[in-house]
């Protein structure tokens, strides 16, 4: 069972948001299938996505075991219809991924404004704490559980009647801001990890929420 006419994978790319982590590659297979292996720098290789015709493999279950490790993956190419043979000694063509360190590299998912409440001239805006697939003692951890004080939120807010934006920052999931009485405001939040120096430092902005809609409450 040779590996003639199989093409090595290329363009191996990690796609990761809030630790949900997928390895993607090319090319779309023609008469071939793929198997992925993942390892930490000091660990053994573990096979995933056996003989798949897909060009992606979900490796979340492996990386969430330790999001602070650095991982390497490789994609093997086999002829279509390949069955593992104990007698086969020929190594199939494979390609290595770039290294991937989830804690430093996973993208921050789009946050959601959970609620806002106005009391007089103050508004309390609460950001929903997103769940991840990282576990501790069989309990899933939130983004805040994993990143702690490394994670902050930036609030953008503006009067519905104007375009001039103000900003506020918090290292919790709550903002308490001053507003003008009788004015409606709109809000959007962004998750930020200030310690990062790369493009994945910030999330995309949350959907805009405006006072006078159902997420808000007003009390005099």
């Amino acid at each position: 069972s040779g590996t003639t006419n199989t093409v090595a994978a290329y363009n191996l790319t990690w796609k990761s948001t809030n630790f949900k982590t997928i390895l993607e590659w090319e090319p779309k297979p023609i008469n071939q299938v793929y198997t992925v292996q993942i390892s930490t720098k000091s660990g053994d290789w573990k096979s995933k996505c056996f003989y798949t015709a897909d060009t992606e493999c979900d490796l979340t279950d492996e990386i969430v075991k330790d999001v602070k490790q650095t991982y390497l993956a490789r994609v093997f190419s086999y002829p279509a219809g390949h069955v593992e043979s104990t007698g086969s000694t020929e190594e199939p063509p494979y390609e290595n991924s770039p290294e991937f360190t989830p804690y430093l590299e996973t993208n921050l998912g789009q946050p959601t404004i959970q609620s806002f409440e106005q009391v007089g001239t103050k508004v309390n805006v609460t950001v929903q704490d997103e769940w991840t697939l990282v576990r501790r003692n069989d309990t899933f951890l939130s983004l805040r559980d994993v990143f702690g004080k490394d994670l902050i939120y930036t609030l953008y807010y503006w009067k519905s009647s104007s375009s001039g934006k103000k900003t506020a920052k918090t290292n919790t999931n709550e903002f308490l801001i001053d507003v003008d009485k009788g004015e409606n405001y709109c809000f959007s939040v962004q998750a930020v990890i200030p310690s990062r120096r790369t493009a994945n430092r910030k999330s995309t902005d949350s959907p805009v929420e405006c006072m006078g809609h159902e997420k808000g409450e007003s009390r005099e």
Epitope: L104, V127, S142, R144, D145, G148, N173, E174, R197
Partner: antibody, heavy 120, light 113 residues
Framework: EVQLVQSGAEVKKPGESLRISCKGS????????IEWVRQMPGKGLEWMGD????????NYSPSFQGHVTISADKSISTAYLQWSSLKASDTAMYYC?????????????WGQGTLVTVSS | DIVMTQSPDSLAVSLGERATINCKSS????????????LTWYQQKPGQPPKLLIY???TRESGVPDRFSGSGSGTDFTLTISSLQAEDVAVYYC?????????FGQGTKLEIK
């Protein structure tokens, strides 16, 4: 096994410069904050600042900002605390520590400490 | 800055008895996002570096004996040693691990009566 090994004791004169080190092993150095803590003779613990070696990002206590510099060389898994001009009041034990795995879960591992004595 | 104040400054307790150390923070250490209190307790024995005992106010670090427990929320926290052992003689520190700058309490010296 996680270990933080600090450089040896130093005796310096006021005005001199100094760099002490903290070498991490047994874990992924780039993804854990290294903390620096001062303990003056017979006194309590004071947090000085920290660094995330993967990005070089630092935080300083206002009490130490401008007087010390924290840096790291991730290629040799070593963090540094340095002074450009020492004072007698810098005489203390200096500890490095590593943050815990989870967010805000304390300083889980500590170095053995470096005793710095500044005297004319 | 968050100020951490411990009480008492020193404490003498008989072997086998309960020891209680209090810690008060000038601001709440409760994270609204995950309802965790970012308060940490350390033990430091003479001539040694500190040792992490408890994080998130009540979560014992791996390997720490279960006679050590932490409680409290917001601004008021307690470290309890249910049955004092000779090896527990040390200085105990609480720490704000909630927000920068991180700050320690002044320490509580625990001795045997």
């Amino acid at each position: 096994e996680v270990q933080l090994v600090q450089s040896g004791a130093e005796v310096k004169k006021p005005g001199e410069s100094l760099r002490i080190s903290c070498k991490g092993s047994g874990y992924t150095f780039i993804t854990y904050w290294i903390e620096w803590v001062r303990q003056m003779p017979g006194k309590g613990l004071e947090w000085m600042g920290d660094i995330l070696p993967g990005s070089g990002s630092t935080n300083y206590s206002p009490s130490f900002q401008g007087h010390v510099t924290i840096s790291a060389d991730k290629s040799i898994s070593t963090a540094y605390l340095q002074w450009s001009s020492l004072k007698a009041s810098d005489t203390a034990m200096y500890y490095c520590a590593r943050s815990g795995y989870y967010g805000n879960s304390g300083f889980a591992y500590w170095g053995q400490g470096t005793l710095v004595t500044v005297s004319s | 800055d968050i100020v951490m104040t411990q009480s008492p400054d020193s404490l003498a307790v008989s072997l086998g008895e309960r020891a209680t150390i209090n810690c008060k923070s000038s601001q709440s250490l409760l994270s609204s996002g995950n309802q965790k209190n970012y308060l940490t307790w350390y033990q430091q024995k003479p001539g040694q570096p500190p040792k992490l005992l408890i994080y998130w106010a009540s979560t014992r670090e791996s390997g720490v004996p279960d006679r050590f427990s932490g409680s409290g929320s917001g601004t008021d926290f307690t470290l309890t040693i249910s049955s004092l052992q000779a090896e527990d003689v040390a200085v105990y520190y609480c720490q704000n691990d909630y927000t920068y700058p991180l700050t320690f309490g002044q320490g509580t010296k625990l001795e045997i009566k």
